[in-house]
Amino acid sequence: SSSPTSSASSFSSSAPFLASAVSAQPPLPDQCPALCECSEAARTVKCVNRNLTEVPTDLPAYVRNLFLTGNQLAVLPAGAFARRPPLAELAALNLSGSRLDEVRAGAFEHLPSLRQLDLSHNPLADLSPFAFSGSNASVSAPSPLVELILNHIVPPEDERQNRSFEGMVVAALLAGRALQGLRRLELASNHFLYLPRDVLAQLPSLRHLDLSNNSLVSLTYVSFRNLTHLESLHLEDNALKVLHNGTLAELQGLPHIRVFLDNNPWVCDCHMADMVTWLKETEVVQGKDRLTCAYPEKMRNRVLLELNSADLDCDPILPPSLQTS
């Protein structure tokens, strides 16, 4: 994960406000909010594990890396980071593990340099379609975001507001085509069962896509064709049973791709023949020698690369336990 990190030294803790009369003034450039640590030299502010319930209003204008992890923010309203003057330098924002369950439209507006955003480990029951685009226009101003980290943002089952979680996340990613410049997208550990058709085609700049530790059961309608810049595709720990010819051809056609497929319940029947042939020839699958059959029972733990066509017959009757992960 590419969350903002800091080599910051010389952090200053916040000092108590000296005079209430000053509070109406804009914050001093070197002021540090209460319960935070600041390093102007590293352009970094850390407000970590302090049970904050809202984003500090008096963030210093120099901040480039902002850590607001391990808090209790609950809701990120529109303009949560809008300041006068704006936080024009803020490039990396980490909000992971801050108990956010709602991110509203325009929450990240007025952050012209924001390149990395990490919302991981927040139970996002309500992610506005316009959280990242800021407006409901059919085409929004391009977002400066290059990396978006959304690992483990799935809320508990009883908080999902009776709608598709996959759909909610996809709506936010595609709204207004604002994220056309996105290069890294991490969506690991979100219980995704599917991706709507053609969703990836609308994120053409992707270099790194992490879909590991979900419950994806098929890639049949997931097109990678337009993702010519894609360098890494993480599909470990899903519920994939076989990759079909169309998918294999698309992956093979990507010039820089490395694919990770470990720990999927591969079904080694006659429909696996094309994938086995491809695996033996391709260089794009990392750790391909670790891929093993899960079904049928007689094939369990057989290494895919060691199979030949005589091993792959049809049709297995699978136990109910296979059908989803």
């Epitope: 379609p129 059919s138 598709s164 759909g167 996809v170 709506a171 595609l174 709204a175 069962l193 599917y194 991706l195 709507p196 058709r197 053609d198 969703v199 609308q202 059961v217 098929s218 049949t220 309608y221 049973k241 076989v242 079909h244 429909h271 049809c314 049709d315 109910p320 059908q323 989803t324």
Partner: antibody
Framework: QVQLQQSGPEVVKPGASVKISCKAS????????MNWVKQSRGKSLEWIGD????????NYNQKFKGKATLTVDKSSSTAYMELRSLTSEDSAVYYC???????????WGQGTSVTVSS | NIVMTQTPKFLLVSAGDRVTITCKAS??????VAWYQQKPGQSPKLLIY???NRSIGVPDRFTGSGYGTDFTFTISTVQAEDLAVYFC?????????FGGGTRLEMK
């Protein structure tokens, strides 16, 4: 909440054409394919085809090529199906249906009855 | 085109019964099968997708299983409101095709 509102029933003469509309609300129209399905009286369901509202790309069941034309108007979040050269065989209820998981239709319109009668 | 053969066509049931409907594909459709319920005078409703995954708000008495060519849909304890026609559908290859339907009626 997701809603698909279809246009009202149609009674048309053989050889004529008809255009059915399906107005979508409650979700981002361009994020999901729209499918069209035919159901003749007392019969099963037949998939006519689908359209990607994002770019207008269509897939048709070969059986309905030349019979049905699928289009969308993104500005009004509306999908359309035109049926031409109608015969009594085309009398049926026609549904639009939003795709969720690829191919599976998670929300359906209320249906539009088309009766071809001279 | 892939043919989905659904059996039986009719089922007479009593409240509390366990009901099983089967669908056989003319060729493998992997795990790309959905099940729908259509009550009289209503539009179809998606119950199950990708063989065994319940759609939002669908009670857990509805389950699906299978892989390849043979699929089963089960209602563990039928209730009066389950009286409807049930359809399987393959979404593995175009054109997507439906089974002929199974009508559930009360004894």
């Amino acid at each position: 909440q997701v809603q698909l509102q279809q246009s009202g029933p149609e009674v048309v003469k053989p050889g004529a054409s008809v255009k059915i509309s399906c107005k979508a609300s409650g979700y981002t129209f361009t994020d999901y394919y729209m499918n069209w399905v035919k159901q003749s009286r007392g019969k099963s369901l037949e998939w006519i085809g689908d359209i990607n509202p994002n770019n207008g790309g269509t897939n048709y069941n070969q059986k309905f090529k030349g019979k049905a034309t699928l289009t969308v108007d993104k500005s009004s979040s509306t999908a359309y199906m035109e049926l031409r050269s109608l015969t009594s065989e085309d009398s049926a209820v026609y549904y639009c249906a939003k795709e969720g998981p690829p191919g599976a239709m998670d929300y359906w319109g209320q249906g539009t009855s088309v009766t071809v009668s001279s | 085109n892939i043919v989905m053969t659904q059996t039986p066509k009719f089922l007479l049931v009593s409240a509390g019964d366990r009901v099983t409907i089967t669908c056989k594909a003319s060729q493998s459709v992997s795990n790309h099968v959905a099940w729908y319920q259509q009550k009289p005078g209503q539009s179809p409703k998606l119950l199950i997708y990708y063989v065994s995954n319940r759609s939002i708000g669908v009670p857990d008495r509805f389950t699906g299983s299978g892989y390849g060519t043979d699929f089963t849909f089960t209602i563990s304890t039928v209730q009066a409101e389950d009286l409807a026609v049930y359809f399987c559908q393959q979404v593995y290859s175009s054109p997507f095709t439906f089974g002929g339907g199974t009508r559930l009626e009360m004894k």
